[in-house]
Interface confidence: medium
């Protein structure tokens, strides 16, 4: 309730967190023109990459384009990609929509189709679908911890969430536990009426709120947070421009004394956790 | 200046065999798809085989299954295995490369060819 006799300042925060969890994924892996179920573990530094600020990134999905290597090769026949002859190709022109930069060569894509030939990484990327059902829904399972620190300087007073008393293997729950930092991911999707497998295909961003409304008055002192969970984007993905949450990245090696890539595009959701409320005190 | 310098060439019975190499020296960005092209008297010069950078291959259907092409990389050389060889293989044959030009787009080197007689 507002008291209006005390001296209010915002929150300062800082935030820590810990995925924990390990998926087993299988897919359909192509080696030497047979295709056959591919087994893997991932773990902790397989799914999740370091962010900017208080987010954390947790990968639910991906598509791979593995041996690529840079050198010349077709375009991808994306709409419009297509040519008939060497005149349909710019060389040097780079279409911001390409993977390369044209070489003035219109070359064989595969048997019916021709596209300008570019210098890139090769293969280009395919536009592929991510799979359905996600390859990494079992990170419905996964918990975070979050460690979040507050200050209110001009009361000169600090705090955290997680208390000495707090059982390591609590899980949060909004009635049982509302204290426990230690969430279950598909709890908070549930907590904010969304279904985390869906989600999961394509991605997305969820927010945890952390709320501290802090009386600090002796008499009656009460400094503890309260947690919320929303989501932050676009969950229409038909309507949306770019649906989801999804970048690439690679992962180098060498072979036959040629520098070549995996290009991963990760899909996953982002979680940005917003901490706010302030600190009252006569 | 970019050279390719073809050996391995000569005469050899029907059902015999061929290692043909081709070194390339010269300065270059790059070498992209390296391969192996063969005239006949008379005839055109036809694909034999190529391989990319990414060592994907690609063969004439005439030679698939008896020849087979490999590159190394560190020594700027191209291979092509000649099994199960036959009267019809016979031809110079010559190395190719493509080789990308920033700015300038893909240049296109030949070597001088040597020759592959299959005769009993």
């Known amino acids: 309730s507002d008291k209006l006799y005390q001296r209010k300042e915002p929150v300062i925060s800082s935030v820590h967190t810990k995925v924990k969890g390990i998926a087993e994924v299988t897919e359909n892996v192509t080696e030497g023109g047979v295709t056959k179920l591919g087994h893997s573990i991932f773990d902790t530094a397989d799914y999740t990459f370091p962010l900017q600020g208080n987010s954390f990134f947790v990968m639910t999905n991906y598509v791979k384009s593995e041996g690529q290597v840079q050198t010349l090769c077709p375009e991808y026949p994306r709409r419009g990609a297509q040519c008939s002859s060497d005149r349909r190709c710019k060389k040097g022109w780079m279409d911001p929509q390409s993977k390369g930069i044209q070489t003035g060569r219109c070359v064989p894509y595969d048997k019916t189709r021709k596209t300008c030939e570019v210098s890139a990484w090769c293969p280009t990327e395919e536009e592929k679908e991510a799979p359905r059902p996600a390859l990494l829904r079992s990170a419905e399972n996964f918990t975070v911890l979050i460690k979040n620190n507050i200050h209110f300087p001009g009361h000169n007073y600090t705090t955290r969430n997680i208390l000495p008393t707090m059982n390591g293997s609590c899980t949060f729950h909004k009635t049982w536990d509302p204290q426990c930092s230690i969430f279950r991911l598909g709890d908070i999707f549930q907590e904010a009426g969304e279904n985390f497998t869906e989600v999961a295909v394509q991605g997305g961003i969820m927010g945890i709120e952390i709320y501290w409304d802090c009386n600090l008055d002796s008499w009656s002192h009460h400094c503890r947070p309260r947690y919320s969970f929303r989501r932050l984007d676009d969950k229409n993905t038909d309507e949306s421009f770019v649906p989801g949450y999804n970048f690439r990245y690679a992962k180098y090696y060498k072979e036959n004394n040629v520098e070549k890539r995996t290009l991963i595009k990760a899909f996953g959701i982002r979680f940005d956790i917003l901490v706010f409320g302030t600190g009252g005190k006569f | 200046e970019v050279q390719l310098v073809e050996s391995g060439g000569g005469l050899v019975q029907p059902g015999g065999s061929l290692r043909l190499s081709c070194v390339v020296s010269?300065?270059?960005?790059?070498?992209?798809?390296m391969g192996w092209y063969r005239q006949a008297p008379g005839k055109q010069r036809e694909l034999v085989a190529t391989v990319t950078r990414g060592d994907i291959t690609n063969y004439a259907d005439s030679v698939k299954g008896r020849f087979t092409i490999g590159r190394d990389n560190a020594k700027n050389t191209v291979y092509l295995q000649m099994n199960s060889l036959k009267p019809a293989d016979t031809a110079v044959y010559y190395c190719?490369?493509?080789?990308?030009?920033?700015?300038?787009?893909?240049?296109?080197?030949w070597g001088r060819g040597t020759q592959v007689t299959v005769s009993s």
């Open positions: 190719n490369i493509d080789s990308y030009i920033i700015g300038a787009g893909v240049r296109d080197y």
């Open positions: 010269g300065s270059m960005y790059r070498i992209d798809n």
